[in-house]
Interface confidence: low
């Protein structure tokens, strides 16, 4: 390999290098390639040089296109007709000179926040592109259509957010925003101007006409209407708060809808329980006033007893199933009927037949094994399932089992 590279001179974007050739293994060196490494690069990377192609008799080159105020080390690799040799030992580490920053923050945007706030956000400029010490940002903003920019200097390279808080900021009003950069060398460019909206005012009126109904022992459906009066805050959706009668309101659970949906289903509730519900409109500024509270009691839980004593027999291409009636307990919803679920052994999707009797006749081909289960249903929902019954593939026309 060539002997270690020496850095003879370094500027903000260039480095003058020299090296001494190593042994050529009896095949003349035809070219050298310069590689560089920084704390920010993944391993060694080839770099641009002047001259662009370094022949085997040239032992100096200028590396160009470096980033200012970044620590570099360099090495050289020799090549001949046989192939590429071992790289030289790295040079010492040297930092390029400082320069004015040239890269502006990406994705300047913002919005949201609390009342009377303008929130401005951006992606920070990576350290290797800051071009010097003392890096920071200049945030410029003005109400849309106004002449004068307001400026704030943020003396921190990590800054990615600025909040302007002032009573004069009207809710959800547009501002022109741009973010510039600076370092110890001076000011760099600004990002392109973008429009960011100040924080909204939360909705000022409650939803109207709240109505709730129990769907089962575990589910409630809630309905409401948009606020009747003119609402100052934009509505992004609604928040439904619900809590059990024996609980405190502060322990309530909340679910949110998005958009202009004016109903929602609340699931995973307990049976025979009185629930209180209230609805609020919300937006990015917060929630508005609460509607009046409405009450709803979930239905009694479904029967806990599964159908028992299931007997089946088959004739022709029919399977006839019989089972014992399920009796609901006092605190359970009465049985309205039964669901018979069946599927082929090899098939994942299940078919369902509903009946209000304690027997059912299934017309099924006999060239498959069947898996069958039965469960009662009620106003409170589906009850407990029987154990799965496997009815084997039947070759003869008559069979029975239990």
């Amino acid at each position: 390999p060539p002997e270690a590279v020496t850095i003879d001179e370094i500027t903000d974007t260039t480095a003058q290098l020299s090296w001494r050739p190593g042994p050529d293994n009896h095949s003349p060196i035809t070219m050298y390639v310069i590689q560089a490494r920084t704390p920010f690069s993944v391993g060694w990377q080839a770099v641009s040089t002047v001259p662009e192609l370094i022949d085997g008799k040239t032992f100096t080159a200028t590396v160009v296109g470096l980033n200012p105020w970044v620590e570099y080390e360099f090495r050289t690799v020799a090549a001949n007709v046989i192939g590429i040799g071992e790289p030289s030992r790295p040079s010492e580490k040297r930092r390029t000179e400082e320069a004015l920053p040239e890269v502006t923050p990406a994705n300047v945007s913002g919005g949201g926040g609390s009342k009377s706030e303008l929130v401005i956000t951006w992606e920070t400029v990576p350290e290797e592109l800051q071009n010097g010490r003392g890096f920071g940002y200049v945030v410029a903003f003005r109400p849309y259509g106004k002449m004068i920019w307001m400026l704030t200097v943020l003396a921190s390279a990590d800054a990615s957010r600025y909040v302007f808080r002032n009573e004069s900021v009207h809710p959800f009003s547009p501002f022109e925003v741009k973010v510039g950069v600076f370092n110890n060398k001076g000011e760099g460019p600004f990002s392109p101007t973008t429009v960011v909206y100040s924080a909204e005012e939360e909705p000022t009126k409650p939803p109207a006409s709240i109505f709730a109904r129990s769907l089962s022992a575990t589910d409630i459906e809630v309905f409401w209407a948009s606020p009747l009066e003119k609402n100052r805050g934009r509505i992004q959706g609604y928040e439904v708060k619900y809590w059990r009668h024996e609980d405190k309101e502060e322990n309530a659970r909340k679910i949110r809808t998005v958009g202009n949906q004016t109903s929602t289903k609340i699931t995973n509730l307990k049976g025979s329980v009185l629930y209180h519900l209230a609805v609020k409109a919300y937006n990015s500024a917060g929630t508005g006033p609460s509607s009046a509270t409405v009450n709803v009691t979930t239905r009694k839980p479904p029967p806990s007893q599964p159908p028992g004593n299931i007997i089946w027999n088959s004739s022709d291409s029919k399977i006839i199933l019989n089972w014992d009636q399920v009796k609901a307990l006092d605190n359970e919803s009465e049985v309205k009927g039964y669901k018979v679920l069946y599927r082929w052994n090899r098939q994942s999707s299940t078919s369902v037949i509903e009946t209000n009797k304690t027997s059912v006749e299934l017309s099924l081909p006999f060239d498959e094994d069947y898996i069958i289960e039965i469960k009662p249903f009620s106003d409170g929902g589906d009850g407990s399932s029987s154990e799965q019954i496997r009815i084997p593939k039947i070759s003869n026309a008559y069979a029975r089992g239990s």
């Epitope: 949201g112 609390s114 704030t152 200097v153 943020l154 003396a155 921190s156 002032n166």
Partner: antibody, heavy 123, light 101 residues
């Protein structure tokens, strides 16, 4: 190194007044929002008041609004808290504090605190 | 109002999570040892100031912020406060006393 040194605490009777001062050094004082935060004996932190870098905007906790006034003298690198109509529940250690960045405000971003000065309101 | 659990304990070297719920969009976390002023350990939900060990980390989801200490040390025993802005005023949580067992 940022340093904040409070003074002016002491014993005062209910209804009385007190003025706290906080001498700041080690940073560009006029660039940063400043705060007063208090802590009653054995209790948690309570934000009291805040003032913008230039002094043009002030914010107060509901419990002190109308009784306390936060101000600053950027030429002297000093923060003040004028406390009037003091009550027993104002008894606390009062900390002077600084926002983390020139653009930060609020109790989410205090990066430097003084050692505090004790205010006792008792008859 | 920001709500914190009053007390949490953790075995030495284990991970502990302290939560803070309220309406702040941006939370900070402070460590306070007896007789000392508080110290900022997390700002803007997830950022760690220089000098704070990397076992401290912050996260935020919805209206809840969390401070996680991964591999708690004896010196981490302290009161921890969250701070934020609730839409009308700056507030601190009631504090969580962390005991390292």
């Amino acid at each position: 190194e940022v340093q904040l040194l409070e003074s002016g605490g002491g014993l005062v009777q209910p209804g009385g007044s007190l003025r706290l001062s906080c001498a700041a050094s080690g940073f560009t004082f006029s660039s940063f929002n400043m705060f007063w935060v208090r802590q009653a004996p054995g209790k948690g932190l309570e934000w009291v008041a805040e003032i913008s870098g230039g002094g043009g905007s002030t914010w107060y906790a509901p419990a002190v609004k109308g009784r306390f006034t936060i101000s600053r003298d950027n030429s002297k690198n000093t923060l003040y808290l004028q406390m009037n109509s003091l009550r027993a529940e104002d008894t606390a250690v009062y900390y002077c504090a600084k926002s983390r960045d020139t653009w930060s405000y609020g109790a989410a971003t205090i990066d430097a605190w003084g050692q505090g000065t004790l205010v006792t309101v008792s008859s | 109002e920001l709500t914190q659990d009053p007390a949490v304990s953790v075995a030495l070297g284990q991970t502990v999570r302290i939560t803070c719920s309220g309406s702040s969009g941006s939370y900070g976390w402070y460590q306070q040892k007896p007789g000392q002023a508080p110290v900022l350990v997390i700002y803007d939900n997830t950022n760690r100031p220089s000098g704070i060990p990397d076992r401290f980390s912050g996260s935020s989801s919805g209206n809840t912020a969390s401070l996680t200490i991964t591999g708690a040390q004896a010196e981490d025993e302290a009161d921890y406060y969250c701070g934020g802005y609730d839409g009308s005023t700056d507030v601190f949580g009631g504090g969580t006393k962390l005991t390292v067992l």
